[in-house]
């Protein structure tokens, strides 16, 4: 089967910092050595970048300053961190990854992984 | 809106070069891949090329290889298809497609005319 | 490369008729990868489904996607006069990208 697998947990619950982490695993048909990694949302029906990094296999994974995410990569495993999360930002996380090179490219797209993030309580002021 | 605007087709003789070109908008370029695909007169559907991202990786369908090149400049929004060695078989209408978040083409352009006659 | 054989060649229907389309793969192509687009007369082609079972932005409920592996089905519910044109399916999970070579629904 020409198709690249993507495995990534079904559900995360993210910190009280809204900090989310989790693994996403690709099955490559073949031998790359550059990787595209994007996180996708999807609400709805509607799906949006979250954020995207390229990266050199056996090189770590670099996002763009300015990012939420941040990523450490193993072998055909990713480690993926997503920062910065509000309730607001519940929803399905998608690891999309591609084998850009050398040729054939491939695609790969997970199942998702729940997000679900939980505003903290304010702490209440305390008389002391 | 998020739209794909082709040019550059027109008549050429066997043998010759012609440049096309797709200008897109309302969307973040340098964040999708776009494919040239074309159709020859009464024809289905033949991929040509694709362009990624940052522009460094490209693949073309082995019809067009070492004829064809594709590059794009994420500063104005446009891509380009370069054509030489112009075949008669290369007559068609030429689409630029966008690459969608999930990998399937879900915005084209109208497409531009491209016809190799002596 | 995956070669994809749509059938059949033409179809001639009514309105309101229901349109069953076929796309077969010369290998396993994961349902996430299958495409589906319409094309009229003089227009670029549509995406009407991806992911083999998923509705573009815009696409109504009467067309819907089906299966996996080999084998992949479009169906139009009950035929609108607007449906007649060419339908194609293709796949992006690999390259070189691959399109069928259509199958034409035409008004009987």
């Known amino acids: 089967c020409k198709a690249m697998h993507v495995a990534q947990p079904a559900v995360v619950l993210a910190s009280s910092r809204g900090i989310a982490s989790f693994v996403c695993e690709y099955a490559s048909p073949g031998k790359a050595t550059e990787v595209r990694v994007t996180v996708l949302r999807q609400a709805d029906s509607q799906v949006t970048e979250v954020c995207a990094a390229t990266y050199m296999m056996g090189n770590e994974l670099t996002f763009l300053d300015d990012s939420i995410c941040t990523g450490t990569s193993s072998g055909n495993q990713v480690n993926l961190t997503i920062q910065g999360l509000r309730a607001m930002d519940t929803g399905l996380y998608i690891c999309k990854v591609e084998l850009m090179y050398p040729p054939p490219y491939y695609l790969g797209i997970g199942n998702g992984t729940q997000i679900y993030v939980i505003d903290p309580e304010p702490c209440p002021d305390s008389d002391f | 809106q998020v739209q794909l605007v082709e040019s550059g087709g027109g008549v050429v003789q066997p043998g010759r070069s012609l440049r096309l070109s797709c200008a897109a908008s309302g969307f973040t370029f340098s964040s999708y891949g776009i494919h040239w695909v074309r159709q020859a007169p009464g024809k289905g559907l033949e991929w040509v090329a694709v362009i990624w991202y940052d522009g460094r990786n490209k693949y073309y369908a082995d019809s067009v290889k070492g004829r064809f090149t594709m590059s794009r400049d994420n500063s104005k929004n446009t891509l380009y298809l370069q054509m030489n060695s112009l075949r008669a078989e290369d007559t068609a209408v030429y689409f630029c497609?966008?690459?969608?978040?999930?990998?399937?083409?879900?915005?084209w352009g109208q497409g531009t005319t491209v016809t190799v006659s002596s | 490369e995956i070669v994809l054989t749509q059938s059949p060649g033409t179809l001639s229907l009514s309105p309101g008729e229901r349109a069953t389309l076929s796309c077969r793969a010369s290998?396993?192509?994961?349902?996430?990868?299958l495409a589906w687009y319409q094309q009229k007369p003089g227009q670029a082609p549509r995406l009407l489904i991806y992911?083999?079972?998923s509705r573009a932005t815009g696409i109504p409920d009467r067309f819907s996607g089906s299966g996996s592996g080999t084998d992949f089905t479009l169906t139009i519910s009950r035929l609108e006069p607007e449906d007649f044109a060419v339908y194609y399916c293709?796949?992006?999970?690999?390259?070189?990208?691959?399109f069928g070579q259509g199958t034409k629904v035409e008004i009987k």
């Open positions: 992911g083999a079972s």
């Open positions: 497609a966008r690459v969608g978040l999930l990998g399937a083409m879900d915005v």
């Open positions: 293709q796949q992006y999970g690999s390259s070189p990208w691959t």
């Open positions: 290998q396993s192509v994961s349902s996430s990868y």
